[in-house]
Interface confidence: medium
């Protein structure tokens, strides 16, 4: 019996069908096939699971997360073996084997193993001002989501004609910040942080209005 | 892998009508602005036009060109992508793209790009 | 209407650097992108912002901007970057993509 190369790991965005791949050759007739789906998650590695189960002509049920959302792909006996997993959850992430024993044909490899990474869009953003908008100021523009795998990056701009930041602007993509050094009327505007990863993005406005001083009246 | 493939083109008289398809799959196509360019044989590219997301108002804007004649739309649940032309004319003869705004907003560039189908405006 | 200019055509020997460029009226004002284009395939984005690079793409490529003309830089070109190179300007915040005519990379 010999299980064929899976792909190292598929990755899946949350909510959608994730389909592991598991194959097999074998010299003997399906009669006695065993299969069981194990999946070690990444969250809780000490602690394997039971995903599915095919034994004596009847599937069984694995880990109570699973039920209702995972099935063998074709019908069973069969030598693709391979199994979906519907609406994904973050916590389905994780190292998956099939063990297929099929006697009297013994030897040979028979572990399949193929990585699952679930991934997240962005959540919707939260921008923020830090520092003082008074004229001559320096500002800190800030922008962050609270999920998103892999981790989104940031990119900020400035919603007029030419979309871009002030010259006296620097922006750091990974950390979602632009400081804005010696801000003057000119800056004022709306802006837009957009937070992107290989799936989704997600963005969030902020209005930055510079205060200029008020004249004193000299009496 | 974050995927496009367009479909709907074909060959067409002037001032006929024609819908293009794009379907997504790889990414939440629901949360991205989707772009229209096309190329011409032998040419370059031209944008044709955009949608954002229904998040962020779901609005379109289109080049001067196609402006009242093609109309971008979107279906979420399907994760699909549509440009509606009408009254064609022979100089819309095209191969069409349909592409993603790589990073959103406007400065992200498009990326990735489908395959493109091809418009003939003949008669 | 606003218009990019790019040369027609560029040569290169492999492994030397590679530049072409993109004027146009304020362009340094404006977000610059760059896409690859090979026979017969859709483009691909190599450059966008002026000069970040989509993962992916390799570090040869980078990108510059200001005054009017932006500049995509090949180093140590290699013939596999033989292709046609468009510039795109995001124009006004309702236009999207403003594209060059186009420079076909001919790595000799």
């Known amino acids: 019996l010999e299980v064929s190369e899976s792909p190292g790991s598929i990755q899946v965005a949350r909510g959608q069908t994730a389909v592991l791949p598991c194959t097999f050759t074998t010299s003997a007739a399906l009669i006695n096939l065993n299969v069981i789906w194990m999946v070690t998650p990444l969250s809780n590695a000490n602690q394997p699971e039971q995903v599915i189960l095919y034994q004596g002509g009847q599937m069984f049920d694995g880990a109570p997360r699973f039920h209702g959302r995972v099935g063998f792909t074709g019908t069973m006996p069969a030598t693709n073996v391979s199994v979906f997993i519907n609406n994904t959850q973050l916590s389905d992430t994780g190292t998956y084997q099939c063990l297929v024993n099929n006697l009297p044909d013994i030897g040979g490899r028979n572990i399949g193993v193929t990585g699952l990474t679930v991934l997240v869009p962005p959540s919707a953003p939260h921008c923020q001002i830090q520092g003082s908008q008074d004229i001559g100021s320096d500002v800190i523009l800030l922008c962050s989501s609270e999920e998103g795998i892999p981790r989104p990056t940031y990119l900020w701009e400035k919603l007029d004609n030419t979309l871009k930041l002030p010259p006296t602007a620097t922006q750091d993509q990974v950390q979602g910040t632009v400081t804005i050094r010696n801000i003057s009327t000119l800056t004022s505007g709306l802006y837009q942080c957009v937070a992107s990863n290989a799936i989704g993005t997600s963005t969030c406005l902020l209005d930055l209005q510079v205060i200029s001083p008020q004249p004193r009246n000299i009496g | 892998e974050v995927q496009l493939v367009e479909s709907g083109g074909g060959l067409v008289k002037p001032g006929g009508s024609l819908r293009l398809s794009c379907a997504a799959s790889?990414?939440?196509?629901?949360?991205?602005?989707m772009s229209w360019v096309r190329q011409a044989p032998g040419k370059g590219l031209e944008w044709v036009g955009r949608i954002k997301s229904k998040t962020d108002g779901g609005t379109t804007d289109y080049a001067a060109p196609v402006k009242g004649r093609f109309t971008i739309s979107r279906d979420d649940s399907k994760n699909t992508l549509y440009l509606q032309m009408n009254s064609l004319k022979t100089e819309d003869t095209a191969v069409y793209y349909c592409?993603?705004?790589?990073?959103?907003?406007?400065?992200?560039?498009?990326?990735?790009w489908g395959q493109g189908t091809l418009v003939t405006v003949s008669s | 209407s606003y218009e990019l200019t790019q040369p027609p055509s560029v040569s290169v020997s492999p492994g030397q650097t590679a530049s072409i460029t993109c004027s146009g009226d304020?362009?340094?004002?404006?977000?610059a992108s760059w896409y690859q284009q090979k026979p017969g395939q859709s483009p691909v984005l190599v450059i966008y912002q002026d000069s970040k690079r989509p993962s992916g793409i390799p570090e040869r490529f980078s990108g510059s901007n200001s005054g009017n003309t932006a500049t995509l830089t090949i180093s140590g070109t290699q013939a596999e970057d033989e292709a046609d190179y468009y510039c795109s300007s995001t124009g006004t915040a309702h236009t999207l993509a403003v594209f060059g005519g186009g420079t076909k990379l001919t790595v000799l």
């Open positions: 592409a993603r705004v790589a990073h959103g907003g406007y400065s992200g560039g498009l990326d990735p």
């Open positions: 790889g990414f939440t196509f629901s949360n991205a602005w």
């Open positions: 304020k362009l340094g004002d404006k977000y």
